[in-house]
Amino acid sequence: ILGGREAEAHARPYMASVQVNGEHLCGGVLVAEQWVLSAAHCLEDAADGKVQVLLGAHSLSQPEPSKRLYDVLRAVPHPDSRPDTIDHDLLLLQLSEKATLGPAVRPLPWQRVDRDVEPGTLCDVAGWGIVSHAGRRPDRLQHVLLPVLDRATCNRRTHHDGAITQRMMCAESNRRDSCKGDSGGPLVCGGVLEGVVTSGSRVCGNRKKPGIYTRVASYAAWIDSVLA
């Protein structure tokens, strides 16, 4: 997260760290007791490493009573996701067992009504992604509030030049932005999961290259079918 600040510890109990061989790779969001939603491209970066999900964490390194690392029973990328595009960049991870719920571990309600968030709405994005252009990684969860950007502006030639489909949404990126390592994490508007950080190799913090988020409401049928 660029231009953000440290989050209040455990105030986002849905927040997950998707890890490979014990290292944070991507963000994720607990959407059901045994399921974490993330970004499909995160799996590509995992190669053949052991994928696990950390829940109940604020610090990645320090011991915390609520922290627990779960093995992944099943990884289900969206069937239409492709390495060369950010379309359908969603991944569902089934945990080896149901998460132990509590004040620091709780699923987040996700948007099912397929309607765009009003431009200008302030939404919260959180993650353990880099906090500087130099690539510094934080130990503790960071967050930032970002205004939603209308799709027409996001589709301008100097922005994303028509690449933003109806299944995506954008948020402003003027110095405050999600960045590398935040992919798969939640964009939360009014206490509801609206978007998932896409995992393209986008420049961060440049206002002409807004953050791109996969709209979960557009994938309600797929999410329901996998969770069923």
């Epitope: 027409a152 100097t158 440049n206």
Partner: antibody
């Protein structure tokens, strides 16, 4: 299939105004800016301005400020350009184009002829 | 405004020949975001312009690979490796990096 259908040719008298339209189909109208260009006979293209169909925000080429006014009607997925105080210099083909990707989609053009 | 100057004005070619069109801007058209929004359009007689190349060298979908774009800064070139009859028309370069966006004066590709 993305289509931009422009209104038909106009023959107008000097000093009058004209309003030409550009109806979009095959995509969600509010997802892309609409741009307008002018092309006088045998000449190159000039950018007039653009409009965000979500909120009506406009940007104009200084050269066309006071000459062109851009508007949209979201309910009919139509963009409009009004040209006022017309002179023979305004006789041209006027194009609308969707921005994104680039100007990949153009209307067929509307010929405006200013003549007494 | 950024002035885009195309040369030549007219380019007579034989079918199967290579054709090159030059486009120069009077200032750099690198955008503040680092990208260069230089595009090429072909306008056939009585038709609207068609996008060929965007961001200097990227072919738009459906554009044959005989079309290629190159250049940087202020100096850009469109090349057609083997001219076909359907390629005839007026070619325009365009810069979208600075407001107002501007087009070149056009180059007419015609049969020799």
């Amino acid at each position: 299939e993305v289509q931009l259908q422009q209104s038909g040719p106009e023959l107008v008298k000097p000093g009058a105004s004209v309003k030409i339209s550009c109806k979009a189909s095959g995509y969600t109208f509010t997802d892309y800016y609409k741009n307008w260009m002018r092309q006088r006979h045998g000449e190159s293209l000039e950018w007039i301005g653009d409009i965000n169909p979500n909120n009506g925000d406009t940007s104009y080429n200084q050269k066309f400020r006071g000459k062109a006014t851009l508007t949209v009607d979201k309910s009919s997925s139509t963009a409009f350009m009004e040209l006022r105080s017309l002179t023979s210099e305004d006789s041209a083909v006027y194009y609308c184009a969707r921005e994104g990707p680039s100007f990949a989609y153009w209307g067929q053009g509307t010929l405006v002829t200013v003549s007494a | 405004d950024v002035l885009m100057t195309q040369t030549p004005l007219s380019l007579p070619v034989s079918l199967g020949d290579q054709a090159s069109i030059s486009c120069r801007s009077n200032q750099t058209i690198v955008h503040s975001n680092g990208d260069t929004y230089l595009e090429w359009y072909l306008q056939k007689p009585g038709q609207s312009p068609n996008l060929l190349i965007y961001k200097v060298s990227n072919r738009f979908s459906g554009v044959p690979d005989r079309f290629s774009g190159s250049g940087s800064g202020t100096d850009f070139t469109l090349r057609i490796s083997r001219v076909e009859a359907e390629d005839l028309g007026v070619y325009y370069c365009f810069q979208g990096s600075h407001v107002p966006p501007t087009f070149g004066g056009g180059t007419k590709l015609e049969i020799k």
